[in-house]
Interface confidence: low
């Protein structure tokens, strides 16, 4: 009853000329131990002789005969469980069907295993996740349907022809279910890896090239932008014009929308790659950037700090402190919005210019009654002189003087 024989092994094994084949195999013959084993190459049943014809690669009988010329073939099994085989080296003409002719005391069985031997080392296969996004860790897998104890190999990862620094984990399987060598590489791609070539290279133990597989990375990423401004230093005067240009240096997938932001807030009706600011005012000073979006999300350029220069505005005076007690100290501060900052100040006391006072602050260490009155100032920068503001009143408190009795 032939159904008593149960085998487990890979359906097809792959190798190349000069390498080797390790065939993991288990069996169960329910009626007793194995008495005879013959390994055929492309066996064919001969009805006349009721026997199998074909090249005998290996023969092990009760007499213990082994074909002397087939030392490269080894039966590594036993009489009741293991039918593992090794062919080393394996040759191109070994391709085809291997037939394991098993005989016990009362039963016979022919088990067939496919062997595919190529002329040259066949390439591994790179497996990528369905989508790769920038900065998200992915696992790249390189799979080769080959592994053999007598022929060590290695899989190396290359990016644009340069070995990748990330540590790869290589695993091998030589089981009755599958035979393979696999290398897995954890990798966090950046947007700049988009379009780059990744290679998995099969090498022998000495690092000699055998074959490879390549893929082009498709890294989804937000748009990468460059902002250019005219004038390049982004410093202008009120009334001048400014042009900012947004350039997309990379986007995957394609970009869909463009917008401009000032101090983090979107500018209305500005959705082209060029931002034209005509006759700028000081209120338009601030940080500008462009934002371009695609299906992954928005990308932002670096910020450009636009400085609109203008002459000083009408100045105000702050007094620390009024009213002041005679003999105390007082400080006056001239405040005026200007860009660039004022470089010169003119101070006035009761409308009359205070000679020698050109600083932002005026300090009077000892206040006297005659210091009371209105203080005002004028600020000046390279663009002009501001207007004198309303000024501030200093009140000086002092004890009675020259008391006379009436």
């Amino acid at each position: 009853d032939s159904s008593k024989w149960v085998f487990e092994h890979p359906e097809t094994l792959y190798a190349w000329e000069g390498a080797c084949v390790w065939i993991p195999c288990t069996y169960r013959a329910l009626d007793g131990d194995l008495e005879s084993f013959i390994l055929f190459h492309n066996p064919e049943y001969n009805k006349n002789t009721s026997k199998f014809d074909g090249t005998r690669l290996y023969e092990s009988t009760k007499d213990g005969k082994v074909p002397s010329e087939q030392k490269r073939v080894q039966f590594l099994g036993d009489k009741n469980k293991n039918c593992t085989l090794s062919i080393h080296p394996v040759h191109l003409n070994d391709s085809g069907q291997l037939g394991l002719r098993m005989e016990s005391k009362t039963e016979k069985w022919m088990e067939r295993i496919h062997l595919n031997v190529s002329e040259r080392p066949f390439p591994p296969h790179i497996q990528l996740p369905p989508e790769i996004q920038e900065s998200q860790e992915v696992t790249l897998t390189c799979l080769l349907n080959f592994s053999c104890y007598g022929y060590p190999i290695q899989l190396q990862w290359l990016l644009e022809g340069v070995p990748m620094r990330q540590a790869a984990v290589t695993s091998t399987s030589l089981t009755i279910k599958s035979v393979f060598t696999r290398s897995e590489l954890k990798f966090s791609p950046q947007w700049s890896h988009h379009g780059k070539i990744v290679t998995c290279q099969l090498q022998d133990a000495d690092g000699k090239f055998l074959s490879n597989d390549t893929v082009q990375l498709n890294v989804k990423h937000t748009p990468k932008l460059e902002i250019k401004v005219t004038p390049s230093d982004a410093i202008v005067r009120e009334g001048d014009s400014v042009t900012m240009t947004c350039e997309v240096s990379s986007s995957n997938p394609e970009y869909t929308t463009v917008s401009w932001l000032k101090d983090g807030t979107s500018l209305k009706k500005q959705n082209t790659f060029t931002l034209n600011l005509r006759e700028v005012t000081k209120d338009q000073s601030g940080k500008y950037c462009c934002q371009v979006s695609n299906d992954v999300g928005p990308g932002r350029s670096e910020e450009v700090f636009l400085q609109v220069q203008y002459a000083p505005e009408p100045s105000t005076v702050q007094i620390l402190h009024s009213p002041a007690v005679e003999g105390s100290q007082v400080e006056f501060l001239c405040m005026s919005l200007a860009n660039p900052l004022p470089t010169n100040y003119t101070w006035y006391h009761n409308g009359k210019e205070m000679q020698g006072r050109t600083e932002e602050k005026v300090h009077i260490p000892k206040i006297l009654p005659w210091h009371a009155g209105t203080y005002s100032c004028v600020a000046e920068n390279i663009l002009g002189t501001g207007q004198r503001g309303p000024g501030a009143e200093l009140d000086v408190q002092y004890p009675p003087k020259k008391v006379t009795t009436v």
Epitope: V248, S250, E254, Y255
Partner: nanobody, 121 residues
């Protein structure tokens, strides 16, 4: 060998129309973002228009918006630039470019040789 071959350029009057074509070979056309650029004498090469791998979205430089339209036919491995209301300032050599990345900058993987467009007033 990758080839991008432009055609359709010529000498026209201001206000006329022209249609430029670019035929690609040696690349998987549908995998590339296709663009048109132009370069006027003594000036830098500038982005004119670009179109996504599937034919959308398309992008046009501000200077040609409303006048020029880019389109592509993946079955023919071709990209087109329909140019209407041509102005003398549109005079330039027009280049077709194939880019793996969608980008408006003058960086491309493959360039055509260019076709001359001259607009007289």
């Amino acid at each position: 060998q990758v080839q991008l071959v432009e055609s359709g350029g010529g000498l026209v009057q201001a206000g006329d129309s022209l249609k430029l074509s670019c035929l690609a070979s040696g690349i998987t056309f549908s995998s590339y973002y296709m663009s048109w650029f132009r370069q006027a004498p003594g000036k830098e090469r500038e982005f004119v228009a670009g179109v996504g791998r599937s034919g959308a979205p398309s992008h046009h430089a501000d200077s040609v918006k409303g006048r020029f339209t880019i389109s592509r036919d993946n079955a023919k491995s071709a990209v087109y630039l329909q140019m209407n209301s041509l102005q003398p300032e549109d005079t330039a050599v027009y280049f077709c470019a194939a880019k793996w990345m969608a980008a408006s900058t003058t960086v491309a993987d493959y360039w055509g040789q260019g076709t001359q467009v001259t607009v007289s007033s």
